[in-house]
Amino acid sequence: EVEKTACPSGKKAREIDESLIFYKKWELEACVDAALLATQMDRVNAIPFTYEQLDVLKHKLDELYPQGYPESVIQHLGYLFLKMSPEDIRKWNVTSLETLKALLEVNKGHEMSPQVATLIDRFVKGRGQLDKDTLDTLTAFYPGYLCSLSPEELSSVPPSSIWAVRPQDLDTCDPRQLDVLYPKARLAFQNMNGSEYFVKIQSFLGGAPTEDLKALSQQNVSMDLATFMKLRTDAVLPLTVAEVQKLLGPHVEGLKAEERHRPVRDWILRQRQDDLDTLGLGLQGGIPNGYLVLDLSMQEALS
């Protein structure tokens, strides 16, 4: 807290400009009018204030707006945004995408801070859903943003927004998140033809059910092994050897290198060994010829 002292004669700030750079903290406190600061916030960004001086300027705004800053001030906070706490930001009502962009720009190149996370949360809640423009903006600044949301939060993403998602935006998503995103992507891309559809849907396939994988296997898609390894194990297990061969096309040879890893390992255990042998890859661990396979889960369901 800066001690309150009268502003020295001739030092009262008439505008926010370079002359304030060498003011001491108490001089800034005494000589800069908070209302003037609020109307000229855009100038603060261009002036090399120290972090100590920025603390004083923030304090002045806090006193002027105890209930939270108006958006006209928030939009021009610039580097002063880095001084805000999540508690400060929770008082704000940010509705303009331009304001969001301006503040994200200040934090550009850094990890998502608690301040930024709170800002985004406030913005999205205010909008009611994660629309395409917002998602475009957020993933441009934070490619991993989508995967930081809970499945519940992802459920508010409209299918139209899925067009903004790039493959790298899904790199850190877990199966629960892809379970929510996949149906939206399927809906968003439903009018595309086979090969174009597969290119777009590929990065969402970690959420695809068995029946959709079976359908893809009939379309000569040539899925690469990296995508196959990200598929849900429970969706892969029911696929036949022939279906997997069609799904992977020339990439089927890659199964040998992955035979000890999920989901390939678990899938092999469910296949007849003689069916696996037809691939000519030397895959081992299938069900020996002559053995009967009982699906106990099906039996329990019937009883």
Epitope: K11, E18, S19, Y23, K24, N45, A46, E52, Y79
Partner: antibody, heavy 119, light 106 residues
Framework: EFQLQQSGPELVKPGASVKISCKAS????????MNWVKQTNGKSLEWIGI????????SYNQKFKGKATLTVDQSSSTAYMQLNSLTSEDSAVYYC????????????WGQGTTLTVSS | QIVLTQSPAIMSASPGEKVTMTCSAS?????MYWYQQKPGSSPRLLIY???NLASGVPVRFSGSGSGTSYSLTISRMEAEDAATYYC?????????FGSGTELEIK
């Protein structure tokens, strides 16, 4: 121990440009503003400008606007001053100087870089 | 911009003698700063905020003043104090320095 280490002497031709460096050590580079000062003939000192290493924002003495450009590289804790369109009037010793807490004077100075502009 | 006039321009003092030099500002300033510079060396901060001694500066140095009139005093001159002394203000933008007082040892 705090230190501001400047680049060595420069001999350049009129019309050319030069970039002087000032490497900071012993303190958090981004916490303190950096200034540049010109000294001609071992006499008067003139303030050129100031830069905030945290945000890269800068301010210049009107006299040096268009002549000097201040930049920083946070990764190497180094401040730079580029001087362009050099003339013999620019021949001087140039210092970088850190501003102390709450604007308590230029508390640490570099050793100075001698610039000679001559054809 | 504020002009700082230092006087005298050159002075000499004997070891042990009290030395006072002044800095007059063309307009009122809040604080004055004083620097010492020896030949071939960088300036060194002596006094900040008019009267505060910078780190490592001997207590024989002191500063005072207000408004447009400031002074630097050395209570007892020592040989190592031979140097040029500059006053500086940044109450008004841009910061400016005085033209210096050259102090010699007798």
């Amino acid at each position: 121990e705090f230190q501001l280490q400047q680049s060595g002497p420069e001999l350049v031709k009129p019309g050319a440009s030069v970039k002087i460096s000032c490497k900071a050590s012993g303190y958090s580079f981004t916490d303190y503003n950096m200034n540049w000062v010109k000294q001609t003939n071992g006499k008067s000192l003139e303030w050129i400008g100031i830069i905030n290493p945290n945000y890269g924002t800068s301010s210049y003495n009107q006299k040096f606007k268009g002549k000097a450009t201040l930049t920083v590289d946070q990764s190497s804790s180094t401040a730079y001053m580029q001087l362009n369109s050099l003339t013999s009037e620019d021949s001087a010793v140039y210092y970088c100087a850190r501003v102390g807490r709450d604007n308590s004077g230029f508390d640490y100075w570099g050793q100075g870089t001698t610039l000679t502009v001559s054809s | 911009q504020i002009v700082l006039t230092q006087s005298p321009a050159i002075m000499s003092a004997s070891p042990g003698e009290k030395v006072t030099m002044t800095c007059s500002a063309s307009s009122s300033v809040s604080y004055m700063y004083w620097y010492q510079q020896k030949p071939g060396s960088s300036p060194r901060l002596l006094i900040y905020d008019t009267s505060n001694l910078a780190s490592g500066v001997p207590v024989r140095f002191s500063g005072s003043g207000s408004g447009t009139s400031y002074s630097l005093t050395i209570s007892r001159m020592e040989a190592e104090d031979a140097a040029t002394y500059y006053c500086q203000q940044w109450s008004s933008y841009p910061p400016t320095f005085g033209s210096g007082t050259e102090l010699e040892i007798k």
